[in-house]
C-alpha cells in the first residue's frame, strides 16, 4: 500500500495536513491554511493514549471496590487506569471489570497453579504417591508418608485424598 | 500570483490511457496537496485523487483505484494524472487544484475525448 | 460516501438582489464546507472555505454560515459578473463530495 497524502502524525482535512494532537491532549480546532491544528491538554481524570484527533479525552476506568476492584497503576493524561482484584480474587476478563473469589481445589486435587490478580486457581488430580485431604487455593498435592524410612510398615494404603497409614511392622518371635 | 496550467485537449480511443499535467507556479509546490477532479459535460464535479508532491504519498477515490495514477515532479513542480482502461464514460474535463483550505485555486481544465 | 444536496437547481434574480443557495450534507461534516464559482470557459475560483471564511480577492458580498448538516452561500446584493454556476464541497471525510450545482440566471 503507497503512503497516504499526509504523513505520519498528520490527518487530512479540508485539502490539507494537519498535525494530529500527542497523547494526552484532544482537538480544539483543525489547522487552517494560516493556522496550527490547536490541542488542549485532558483534564483530570481523563486520557487520550495515541496520537489523535478526538474532540473527547476518554474517562479514566473506575475501579470499583463493590465489585472487588482496586487500582492497580493510577491513569495519567496518556494512560488509562489499571483495575486488578482485591486478595483472593481475580479478574473475571482480561479487561477486568469484575471479579470473583479464587477457586478452591477439592479434596483429591492439588494446587498447579495458585491464582494471580488476572488468573484463577489451576488445579490438578493428586496423582498415584500423592494427596490432598483439604479443599484449598494454596496446597499442592502432598506425597505420601514414606513408612519405611521410619522403620514402619504401610497399615492402610493411601489414596488421592489421605495420606497412608504406617504401623510398627510386626516382630518375628 | 499562484497558477496552475494544465496541458491541452486530448482525444483518445476506449482502452487507451491518458496523462495530463498541471504546472504550478507562484508558490512552493511541495508546501500544498495536489487535488484532481472531473466533470463530465452538464454534470457536477467528482473527486479523483489528491497527492502530496513533497513526497508522493496518495489518496485515491474508491471509484478510480487501480485506474488513476497521481504522480509529481518536484524538479519542473509538474503535477500528472493518469487515467487507464478509458470508456466513453470518461469522457469529461479534468482539473487539477491547489490544496490548502479547499481547493483554493484551479486549472483551466482540459478536455479529455473518449470515443472511437 | 458524504452526499452533498444543494438547492435549488437553478434560479433567477435580478442585479441587486439578495441571493440565498444551501447545501444539506448527508451527515455532520463540522463546519468543513467550501464554496465555488463556476463561469464558462473560465477557471473554478474559491469563493468560501470553511463554512465562513472567505478566500482572498473575494469581494464581502459573498457570505457563508451554517454548521452540522446544513450551509447556505448567501449574495447580498448580486452584481453582473455574479452570474455563473455555485458549487458546494465537503472537506471533511474522504471521498471529497460536491453539491450538483446551482446555476445563478439573470431574470
Known amino acids: 500500500e503507497p503512503p497516504t497524502a499526509c504523513r505520519e502524525k498528520q490527518y487530512l482535512i479540508n485539502s490539507q495536513c494537519c498535525s494530529l494532537c500527542q497523547p494526552g491532549q484532544k482537538l480544539v480546532s483543525d489547522c487552517t491554511e494560516f493556522t496550527e491544528t490547536e490541542c488542549l491538554p485532558c483534564g483530570e481524570s481523563e486520557f487520550l493514549d495515541t496520537w489523535n484527533r478526538e474532540t473527547h479525552c476518554h474517562q479514566h476506568k473506575y475501579c470499583d471496590p463493590n465489585l472487588g476492584l482496586r487500582v492497580q497503576q493510577k491513569g495519567t493524561s496518556e494512560t488509562d487506569t489499571i483495575c486488578t482484584c482485591e486478595e483472593g480474587w481475580h479478574c473475571t476478563s482480561e479487561a477486568c471489570e469484575s471479579c470473583v473469589l479464587h477457586r478452591s481445589c477439592s479434596p483429591g486435587f492439588g494446587v498447579k497453579q495458585i491464582a494471580t490478580g488476572v488468573s484463577d486457581t489451576i488445579c490438578e488430580p493428586c496423582p498415584v504417591g500423592f494427596f490432598s485431604n483439604v479443599s484449598s487455593a494454596f496446597e499442592k498435592c502432598h506425597p505420601w508418608t514414606s513408612c519405611e524410612t521410619k522403620d514402619l510398615v504401610v497399615q492402610q494404603a493411601g489414596t488421592n485424598k489421605t495420606d497412608v497409614v504406617c504401623g510398627p511392622q510386626d516382630r518375628l518371635r | 500570483q499562484v497558477q496552475l496550467v494544465q496541458s491541452g485537449a486530448e482525444v483518445k480511443k476506449p482502452g487507451s490511457s491518458v496523462k495530463v499535467s498541471c504546472k504550478a507556479s507562484?508558490?512552493?509546490?511541495?508546501?500544498?496537496?495536489i487535488e484532481w477532479v472531473r466533470q463530465a459535460p452538464g454534470q457536477g464535479l467528482e473527486w479523483i485523487g489528491v497527492?502530496?508532491?513533497?513526497?508522493?504519498?496518495?489518496n485515491y477515490n474508491e471509484k478510480f483505484k487501480g485506474r488513476a495514477t497521481l504522480t509529481a515532479d518536484k524538479s519542473t513542480s509538474t503535477a500528472y494524472m493518469e487515467l487507464s482502461s478509458l470508456r466513453s464514460e470518461d469522457t469529461a474535463v479534468y482539473f487539477c487544484?491547489?490544496?490548502?483550505?479547499?481547493?483554493?485555486?484551479w486549472g483551466q481544465g482540459t478536455l479529455v475525448t473518449v470515443s472511437s | 460516501d458524504i452526499q452533498m444536496t444543494q438547492s435549488p437547481s437553478s434560479l433567477s434574480a435580478s442585479v441587486g438582489d439578495r441571493v440565498t443557495i444551501t447545501c444539506r450534507a448527508s451527515?455532520?461534516?463540522?463546519?468543513?464546507l467550501n464554496w465555488y464559482q463556476q463561469k464558462p470557459g473560465k477557471a473554478v475560483k474559491l469563493l468560501i472555505s470553511?463554512?465562513?471564511r472567505l478566500h482572498s480577492g473575494v469581494p464581502s458580498r459573498f457570505s457563508g454560515s451554517g454548521s452540522g448538516t446544513d450551509y447556505t452561500l448567501t449574495i447580498s446584493s448580486l452584481q453582473p459578473e455574479d452570474f455563473a454556476t455555485y458549487f458546494c464541497?465537503?472537506?471533511?471525510?474522504?471521498?471529497?463530495?460536491f453539491g450538483q450545482g446551482t446555476k445563478v440566471e439573470i431574470k
Open positions: 451527515q455532520d461534516i463540522s463546519n468543513h
Open positions: 507562484g508558490y512552493g509546490f511541495t508546501n500544498y496537496l
Open positions: 464541497q465537503q472537506g471533511n471525510t474522504l471521498p471529497w463530495t
Open positions: 497527492i502530496n508532491p513533497g513526497y508522493g504519498g496518495v
Open positions: 470553511s463554512t465562513s
Open positions: 487544484a491547489r490544496g490548502g483550505s479547499g481547493f483554493a485555486f
